[in-house]
């Protein structure tokens, strides 16, 4: 058993049918010694008397808010949550496995640049009685500070007969050095509590591996005289690290016909312009990627040819 926060405790339960459970001793936070009784949640049934209460925690029915009283007055509370292990594996029931980029991916994180700011998100089908707490650091043995905000509900979607809820959090490394080579990964830890169930989820990554630039901005077409060709130009996204001479991007320019089956013409360039043939009803799209490290491509920025 360990303390999650004041008066909230997590009981680690190795569960299997007929498991004996965990013996937990609760102590009433009071100088009083006599006349103390204990109850669970809203029930008036007295579970025991005395300054300490010993319980056997076998299942969620044994978790909840234990209260000690004296003469009708509440003395203190202890909320017991369960962290359940089955077959040697801690439960991961609260969050959905996103399966990208691999199985057992519960947290996904992205950074728009090298400033040390990043966003993580996760999915759940649970709509109520749900709280999250996020902590982060660089390295784990001698951790360096990363400050995370509160997790917020960022999207709701319907998936078949189910509703899915996306939560996200923004974090910022306290003393980020954008140009430095990373040697220690960022660690992100999410505590999830649903009703009386506690679970924790972790992710470990280097900022360079989660970089995904914003799409190029100010995408424009300039027709070339007496030609079907156009000059496409764009700019670095505002959110990308500066100076651009050091934090350079490479770009992919694509001409796509109206039909998805039509052949796509693609050009790769390090410049912020390219000359392409603009077909009728086609569209031109440009996306960006770090020039020197193969992290994710940005989403596409698009304009119609006409």
């Amino acid at each position: 058993i360990w303390e999650l926060k004041k008066d909230v405790y997590v009981v680690e339960l190795d569960w299997y049918p007929d498991a004996p459970g965990e013996m937990v001793v609760l102590t009433c936070d009071t100088p009083e010694e006599d006349g103390i009784t204990w109850t669970l949640d809203q029930s008036s049934e007295v579970l025991g008397s005395g300054k300490t209460l010993t319980i056997q925690v076998k299942e969620f029915g044994d978790a909840g808010q234990y209260t000690c009283h004296k003469g009708g007055e509440v003395l203190s509370h202890s909320l017991l949550l369960l962290h359940k292990k089955e077959d040697g594996i801690w439960s991961t029931d609260i969050l959905k496995d996103q399966k990208e980029p691999k199985n057992k991916t519960f947290l996904r994180c992205e950074a728009k640049n090298y400033s040390g700011r990043f966003t993580c998100w996760w999915l759940t089908t649970i709509s109520t009685d749900l709280t999250f707490s996020v902590k982060s650091s660089r390295g784990s043995s001698d951790p360096q500070g990363v400050t995370c905000g509160a997790a917020t509900l960022s999207a709701e979607r319907v998936r078949g007969d189910n509703k899915e809820y996306e939560y996200s959090v923004e974090c910022q490394e306290d003393s980020a050095c954008p140009a430095a080579e990373e040697s220690l990964p960022i660690e992100v830890m999410v505590d999830a509590v649903h009703k009386l169930k506690y679970e924790n989820y972790t992710s470990s990554f280097f900022i360079r591996d989660i970089i995904k630039p914003d799409p190029p901005k100010n995408l424009q077409l300039k027709p070339l005289k007496n030609s079907r060709q156009v000059e496409v130009s764009w700019e670095y996204p505002d959110t990308w690290s500066t100076p651009h001479s050091y934090f350079s991007l490479t770009f992919c320019v694509q001409v796509q016909g109206k039909s998805k089956r039509e052949k796509k013409d693609r050009v790769f360039t390090d410049k912020t312009s390219a000359t392409v043939i603009c077909r009728k009803n086609a569209s031109i799209s440009v996306r960006a990627q770090d020039r020197y490290y193969s992290s994710s491509w940005s989403e596409w920025a698009s304009v119609p040819c006409s």
């Epitope: 569960w15 299997y16 049918p17 299942e59 969620f60 029915g61 089955e86 029931d93 089908t125 649970i126 078949g160 007969d161 189910n162 509703k163 649903h194 009703k195 009386l196 169930k197």
Partner: nanobody, 123 residues
């Protein structure tokens, strides 16, 4: 919302068997732990059995252990309670419930409930 409809109740002799079914509709059945409870006249609702969302773990009340078996068929969105060696003490209305906490024998840990099906065991 999850809707639960129980069926399969009836009148049987002591020592006989009965299989209850609970059909779920609405939100994704596969996300929920499923349980059976029962209530005899003048008594509180009593836990019988529960099965986790994967169908890989079960948990029973001591009073039915070895006689009752809970199972689920995710393809059919149905949970079953196979009851054998029935006793007159098993007479009650049997309720199906869906929740997110496994294992739990406490009724308030379940979010959705069916209307119940009557089981009567005569001696």
């Amino acid at each position: 919302e999850v809707q639960l409809v129980e069926s399969g109740g009836g009148v049987v002799q002591a020592g006989e068997s009965l299989r209850l079914s609970c059909a779920a509709s609405g939100r994704s059945f596969s996300d929920y732990e499923m349980g059976w409870f029962r209530q005899a006249p003048g008594t509180e609702r009593e836990f019988v059995a529960t099965i986790n969302w994967r169908g890989s773990s079960t948990y029973y009340a001591d009073s039915v252990k070895g006689r009752f078996t809970i199972s689920r068929d995710s393809a059919k969105n149905t949970v079953y309670l196979q009851m054998s060696s029935l006793k007159p003490l098993d007479t009650a209305v049997y309720y199906c419930a869906a929740g997110r906490l496994f294992p739990s024998s406490r009724s308030r840990d379940y979010d959705y409930w069916g209307q119940g099906t009557q089981v009567t065991v005569s001696s």
